[in-house]
Interface confidence: low
Amino acid sequence: MMTGTIETTGNISAEKGGSIILQCHLSSTTAQVTQVNWEQQDQLLAICNADLGWHISPSFKDRVAPGPGLGLTLQSLTVNDTGEYFCIYHTYPDGTYTGRIFLEVLESSVAEHGARFQIP
């Protein structure tokens, strides 16, 4: 039985040319996370494997950076980056959990960043 839940940064916006952090959080389960995939619609952006570490898809290596944690940093944003992003948690024994984030890249400087980092 899958008891876990995925929390995400939700719907977020950022300025064209800027950067944004995509983040998901799997909670309420003791299942072991074996791999996290980050996908944009049907394209694979990155994989973080528990044993092998990070792999960034070659076509995104210039604009996608790993972390922090299991998150993903997108930089040099363009309007074409607007759309849905998915974090896919592969776990044992639960199976697969998927979280959705919608990113809107704005031309103006009024973008509100959804992911804010506080000093610990």
């Epitope: 570490g53 922090p68 944690g69």
Partner: nanobody
């Protein structure tokens, strides 16, 4: 327990250089990275490095900053050249702390660029 300890910050004149270090203990990491936070602003990503050596940089520091890692020492470095006043911030080291939400931050090291 994972510990991240940054060092190397300080006061430097515009155009000058600094080298930050982040020593990690407690486990082996897939990647290490640097973020920074200027007063009154959000924490922003600066650079990341994988253990395999691949590096990434924010556009604002490309060509001026170089991130590297010494895997044998579990230490990451950030060489900062041609520093500008807008680089003034507290610089934080981070890494992947296993496979959960609670990644680790260091305590930060202050970099001040001023004449």
């Amino acid at each position: 327990e994972v510990q991240l300890v940054e060092s190397g910050g300080g006061l430097v004149q515009p155009g000058g250089s600094l080298r930050l270090s982040c020593a990690a203990s407690g486990r082996t990491f897939s990647f290490m990275g640097w973020f920074r936070q200027a007063p009154g602003k959000e924490r922003e990503w600066v650079a990341s490095v994988l253990r395999g050596g691949y590096t990434w940089y924010a556009d604002s520091v490309k060509g001026r900053f170089t991130i590297s890692a010494d895997n044998s020492k579990n230490t990451a470095y950030l060489q900062m050249n041609s520093l500008k006043p807008e680089d003034t911030a507290v610089y934080y080291c981070t890494t992947d702390r296993g496979y959960n939400w609670n990644y680790d931050w260091g305590q930060g090291t202050l970099v001040t660029v001023s004449s």
